[in-house]
């Protein structure tokens, strides 16, 4: 039985030509996690192995950095990053959870960052 | 304390295989992955591969893909690198060396297996 | 891949003095990298890992900086068992790398 939960940064909003930084944390199980990867809709942006370290998909490699921990900073960000990322856990012997969080990407300087909020 | 001991040095026809062993001590084998380095002529050092003892799973470095093959031995503890067709090129010591878990650094090595290729 | 290039290759030094090896990547490992020591005969040894973070039991006189391309290590002061063999290793993603190695020998 799947007894974990994938708590996420929830919605998130931040300045265009800023950063922000991804984060999910896994809890509420002993399951052993082998690997992270980091969607935008069904695009791939990165993978981060428990053996192999990190791998950045080669269209993100100058907008993206690996961390903190198993999380991800996206940079340099544009009005078109705005929408869905998930952050999908592969862990044994549990199986997969993913988390989701949702980035608008503001013209403006009124970008504040939404409460977190968990996903079970 | 932690300990990885590997097997005594071999020397070997062209040609030939051999098979080494890395065995682990003072900690759970199958909580850190084993990696193999190369170091030829005392000089600098080149990643193998790596195998994760829990799973089984490996990971082959390309210039190495056909040369070696990694396995474990769950009852002894003990990681075991086959290197094949074996010529003088593949004369060097040969290091056990293990990693933890998104951690990509090697934190204990064996104590070094020479493997000298000669006819 | 990821190639590693130490500098200087070999160094000379007094007992007491500073000095500093440095490694560069081929590519942005961001803070990904280890160093190791290793003595004539002897298995490498981990000092540092994530650029500057030291490895249980190494000594404060130990240390490592850097960042993306460009890192370093110090080591202030030197004692007679620091000399020896240093290599950088990166460990951003596989496969892993390591420097050519920076010989430090007693002047």
């Known amino acids: 039985m799947m007894t974990g939960t994938i708590e996420t940064t929830g919605n998130i909003s931040a300045e265009k030509g800023g950063s922000i930084i991804l984060q999910c944390h896994l809890s509420s199980t002993t399951a052993q996690v082998t690997q992270v990867n980091w969607e935008q809709q069904d695009q791939l942006l990165a993978i981060c192995n428990a053996d192999l370290g990190w791998h950045i998909s080669p269209s993100f490699k100058d907008r993206v950095a690996p961390g903190p921990g198993l999380g991800l900073t996206l940079q340099s960000l544009t009005v078109n990053d705005t929408g869905e990322y998930f952050c999908i856990y592969h862990t044994y012997p549990d199986g997969t959870y993913t988390g989701r969080i949702f980035l608008e990407v503001l013209e403006s300087s009124v970008a504040e960052h939404g409460a977190r909020f968990q996903i079970p | 304390e932690f300990q990885l001991q590997q097997s005594g040095p071999e020397l070997v026809k062209p040609g030939a295989s051999v098979k080494i062993s890395c065995r682990a001590s003072g900690y759970s084998f199958t909580a850190y992955s084993m990696n193999w380095v190369q170091q030829t002529n005392g000089k600098s050092l080149e990643w193998i591969g790596v195998?994760?003892?829990?799973?089984?799973?490996?990971n082959y470095n390309q210039k190495f893909r056909d040369k070696a093959t990694l396995t474990v031995d769950h009852s002894s503890s003990a990681a075991y690198m086959q290197l094949n067709s074996l010529t003088s090129e593949d004369s060097a010591v040969y290091f056990c060396?293990?990693?933890?878990?998104?951690?990509?650094?090697?934190?204990?090595w064996g104590t070094g297996t020479t493997v000298t290729v000669s006819s | 891949d990821i190639q590693m290039t130490q500098s200087p290759a070999s160094l000379s030094a007094s007992v007491g003095e500073t000095v500093t090896i440095t490694c560069r990547a081929s590519e942005n490992i961001f803070s990904y990298l280890a160093w190791y020591q290793q003595k004539q005969g002897k298995s490498p040894q981990l000092l540092a890992y994530n650029a500057e973070t030291l490895a249980e039991g190494v000594p404060s006189r130990f240390s490592g900086s850097g960042s993306g391309t460009q890192f370093s290590l110090k080591i202030s002061s030197l004692q007679s068992e620091d000399f020896g063999s240093y290599y950088c290793q990166h460990h951003f993603g596989v496969p892993w790398t390591f420097g050519g190695g920076t010989n430090l020998e007693i002047k």
């Open positions: 195998i994760n003892p829990k799973f089984g799973t490996t």
């Open positions: 060396a293990r990693n933890g878990n998104f951690a990509w650094y090697f934190d204990v």
